[in-house]
Amino acid sequence: TQHGIRLPLRSGLGGAPLGLRLPRETDEEPEEPGRRGSFVEMVDNLRGKSGQGYYVEMTVGSPPQTLNILVDTGSSNFAVGAAPHPFLHRYYQRQLSSTYRDLRKGVYVPYTQGKWEGELGTDLVSIPHGPNVTVRANIAAITESDKFFINGSNWEGILGLAYAEIARPDDSLEPFFDSLVKQTHVPNLFSLQLCGAGFPLNQSEVLASVGGSMIIGGIDHSLYTGSLWYTPIRREWYYEVIIVRVEINGQDLKMDCKEYNYDKSIVDSGTTNLRLPKKVFEAAVKSIKAASSTEKFPDGFWLGEQLVCWQAGTTPWNIFPVISLYLMGEVTNQSFRITILPQQYLRPVEDVATSQDDCYKFAISQSSTGTVMGAVIMEGFYVVFDRARKRIGFAVSACHVHDEFRTAAVEGPFVTLDMEDCGYNIPQTDESTLMT
């Protein structure tokens, strides 16, 4: 999980105001054991701010200390600020918790830019707008950090929802979700609906806004339209998947599919952008530039550095292409595609926009660590992390931002041969993953 390159992401207002809420289709999947179709208490339990993270309210310790915690499917530690920091309004005070237990072990997590370090312990944890359970979980109490916390983001910690293999300091440190499932009757599954604003929000709007839903232990059918399509989790470390084809406005990028997954492809709620391997990024940008050639933008825009601004309400969405990622299906030789709109990959930037302007950053960027399907992808979809069945489901989100001409889509099946060949096998070495 990277901060800096891997900034946590954007949220916004959930539900109808964000654009058209699509009508629900009636052909639902059959119910599965332990999965109710409605989780009212968990709907709209996420908030956040553009480019800075979706967070959920959690309580830690006895008596409970309330903290906002970034929801991150790209890491596996539950880590919270535990010392004063200029960007933190509050922090975990272990000395005030009667149930805190010190593990007498430190943890140090460096990123490409920045780091955090802390002390490991366990304490009682619950999620007020989640399942009605309390679990004893490992907690990294962050005592020192650099470029980790974000000024004004309103979160004080991070909930790593990926697997133990990438936990720090090592895979013996049980992640929160594993503890939750072991200690309770909560099914081994969670789902995320991240609702991008689609337009810039000022500070007061953000603080009062809703950013989406994390449904712990199930699937809420009100949060998506159409059918859920599942792709296998290739390996349980990150939420690794396999992309088998990429299209820009229906035009195949025509690359060896291994390139799309070099050196992996992951679904990561803690990354803002859709990040693509260098060769894939270059080909995709070339294709997007060609598709949107009626207007020309500076090089810095395509690098995600410069903003492009249009007079309020005049953003020419129609000149930008849709992007489709084909994912390996559950059935041999079958794939499905997820399609996002420019409303997902052009990220509104609220600091600069005025009442006269709507300003956007290009939220597709280059990666040296494989494809990262961050908020740009996830904001189009309801994403089900079905750990029990080692698969990830995608359906069109009921809150995704679109216009009257195009919507995000999840469609299939498509016949795709030799999909296994699309996966990249990372050479097994003693190399640490600490700098991912």
């Epitope: 009626t294 207007e295 020309k296 810095g300 410069q306 601004c309 600069v352």
Partner: antibody
């Protein structure tokens, strides 16, 4: 080397349309690396960006002037033009044409400028 | 909209002296800032781009620094031809429409 030269009437009556042309010499206006823009400077004041155009015809305008401005390009003549309608005395200024890079997005080359006075 | 504020409005110095001009942005513009020089009766000329890179043909006595919101143009030793008005411009947002109000460097 590439040069820009503005031309057009130096005096325009209030409520009429100001029309200026910028001729590009020593290079092609059809370069894929540049936009071509207009900036003005009222006497004794600062610089105000008016708008710009790409050789394909794609335009960007200053919102405060958008309702009155039209910028067009004639690649066959290697020229681009500015029309500003319903002028008032506040539009009296030196009008500059300039080149804007897409790689380095600054005004890296300017014409000498032409003074346009709005007066009856 | 990002506002650029230049200071001082006027700088009175003698040839050979060091000139330090400031440009402050109302919000971060990263390093997407340029400096232009304008002499009386002439068009502006690009001096510095991307906050610190000298444009072609610009003497080494001109240097730019800063990033985010605070930028500085320094003329290490003023030559007679350097007395002019200097403008900053941000292109963090496209289209590139925002200029500062200018600083006049005059002979003391």
């Amino acid at each position: 080397q590439l040069q820009l030269q503005e031309s057009g009437p130096g005096l325009v009556k209030p409520s009429e349309t100001l029309s200026l042309t910028c001729t590009v010499s020593g290079g092609s206006i059809s370069s894929s690396s540049y936009y071509w823009g207009w900036i003005r400077q009222p006497p004794g004041k600062g610089l105000e960006w008016i708008g710009m155009i790409y050789y394909s015809g794609s335009t960007w305008y200053n919102p405060s002037l958008k309702s009155r401005v039209t910028i067009s390009v004639d690649t066959s003549k290697n020229q681009f033009s500015l029309k500003l309608s319903s002028v008032t005395a506040a539009d009296t200024a030196v009008y500059y044409c300039a080149r804007v890079g897409l790689g380095v997005s600054y005004f890296d080359l300017w014409g000498r400028g032409t003074l346009v006075t709005v007066s009856s | 909209e990002i506002v650029l504020t230049q200071s001082p409005a006027t700088l009175s110095l003698s040839p050979g002296e060091r000139a330090t001009l400031s440009c402050r942005a109302s919000q971060s513009v990263s390093s997407y800032l340029a400096w232009y020089q304008q002499k009386p009766g002439q068009a502006p000329r690009l001096l510095i781009y991307d906050a610190s890179k000298r444009a072609t043909g610009i003497p080494a006595r001109f240097s730019g620094s800063g990033s985010g919101t605070d930028f500085t143009l320094t003329i290490s030793s003023l030559e007679p031809e350097d007395f002019a008005v200097y403008y900053c411009q941000q292109v963090y947002t496209w289209p590139p429409r925002t200029f500062g109000g200018g600083t006049k460097v005059e002979i003391k």
